[in-house]
């Protein structure tokens, strides 16, 4: 096990997850850690505890390894970091990778007020409701601006979008969370259509896929207690 020293002089590795940092309960996920070609061992930590290691074989590329989580559950959702060793030295920690498990317990309802098809500049609010009491709701937009909003609420949360622009058009889903890394099933998708303006923008996104494996997100919130943390949602974190 890695020993903390003041001489962690090797550059920090890059960590990312495939196919996504959002994983349906019971599905598998790969966590990649990329360090150096000279690395003799990689270690993966979960919530600060030693989780797994790999000693790459010389016949393979040694600058990165894949850690396989065969069945994602609420017990494997959370913050992952990795390190690598080269010679006697250990690297600094990678940036945190935050894995979320979805598909737990219940399915929320998502609807939009006043209606799914609105004119440019109209005020729009999304509502997410979950029968099971929860602490936080997340609203996700597929593709588009690739960001998440979250709101605290017991069984319902509202997401005021303000006067909509063409950038708001697209397909949305919401989740209820039981903690930051354990989320409900996704709601049914709601597609927001925007009409009016210079061009006819009422068309829905051309990509019909709704699989979470194809979604990429950044965390974006206006809650005072939470700060923007792009490392949470980027598949690759290396800043």
């Amino acid at each position: 096990q890695r020993i903390n020293t003041e001489k962690e002089t090797l550059p920090k590795p890059i960590i990312w997850a495939k196919p996504s940092i959002m994983v349906t309960n019971g599905n598998s996920v790969n966590i990649w850690c990329q360090g150096a070609q000279s690395a003799s061992e990689y270690q993966l930590y979960f919530e600060g505890s030693f989780f797994a290691l790999e000693r790459p074989k010389p016949s393979r590329s040694m600058n990165k390894v894949r850690f396989f989580i065969s069945q994602m559950t609420s017990h494997t959702a959370g913050i992952y970091t990795c390190f690598y060793q080269s010679g006697e030295l250990w690297s600094k920690s990678s940036n945190p990778l935050k894995l979320v498990v979805t598909g737990l317990y219940d399915t929320p309802n998502l609807w939009v007020y006043p209606r799914p098809e609105v004119t440019l500049g109209e005020n729009v609010t999304f509502f997410c409701q979950l029968k099971t009491a929860t602490s936080k709701f997340f609203l996700l937009k597929e593709r588009g601006s690739n960001h998440i909003q979250n709101k605290y609420g017991n069984i319902q949360a509202e997401f005021p979008m303000g006067p909509v622009t063409r950038a708001h058009r697209g397909t949305y889903r919401c989740f209820g969370s039981y903690n930051d890394y354990a989320w409900s099933f996704p709601s049914e998708p709601v597609t927001l259509l925007i009409t009016g303006g210079v061009e006819n923008s009422s068309l829905a996104p051309t990509d019909p896929t709704s699989s979470l494996d194809y979604w990429e997100f950044d965390l974006s919130t206006n809650e005072s207690g939470l700060q923007k943390d792009s490392a949470f949602w980027d598949h690759t974190t290396q800043n």
Partner: nanobody, 126 residues
């Protein structure tokens, strides 16, 4: 579905040896990473040793040099050879598997394991 059955536990004197076996059902054993954990009375379950599907091993500091983990893919069995046993090794020993896995992954954290045996009791006393 994978089933794991441990055997080989028993009572032994300090300094003695035991070999635990864990037999796995199904054809997935060769693609599984395996591990041994133990739980002493009134304590939390702790990691003992693990082996990747390709045979790489890792040990808890408390058993390093005394315990050896190995596997026989032809027999779908993983072993834990325990020697120089001490009173503090007294515990229920559990075999666990990660199925499937990849490459040389060695899993140390119990949350990584998706299949568990029922355990076998090892008692070390004079």
């Amino acid at each position: 579905e994978v089933q794991l059955v441990e055997s080989g536990g028993g009572e032994v004197q300090p300094g003695g040896s035991l070999r635990l076996s864990c037999a796995a059902s199904g054809r997935t054993f060769a693609s599984a990473a395996m591990g041994w954990f133990r739980q002493a009375p009134g304590k939390e379950r702790e990691f003992v040793a693990a082996i990747s599907r390709s045979g790489d091993t890792y040990y808890a500091d408390s058993v390093k040099g005394r315990f050896t983990i190995s596997r026989d893919n032809a027999k779908n069995t993983v072993y834990l050879q325990m020697s120089s046993l001490r009173a503090e090794d007294t515990a229920v020993y559990y075999c666990a598997a990660v199925v499937p896995t990849y490459g040389n992954n060695i899993y140390v954290h119990s949350a990584a394991y998706n299949y568990w045996g029922q355990g076998t009791l090892v008692t070390v006393k004079p």
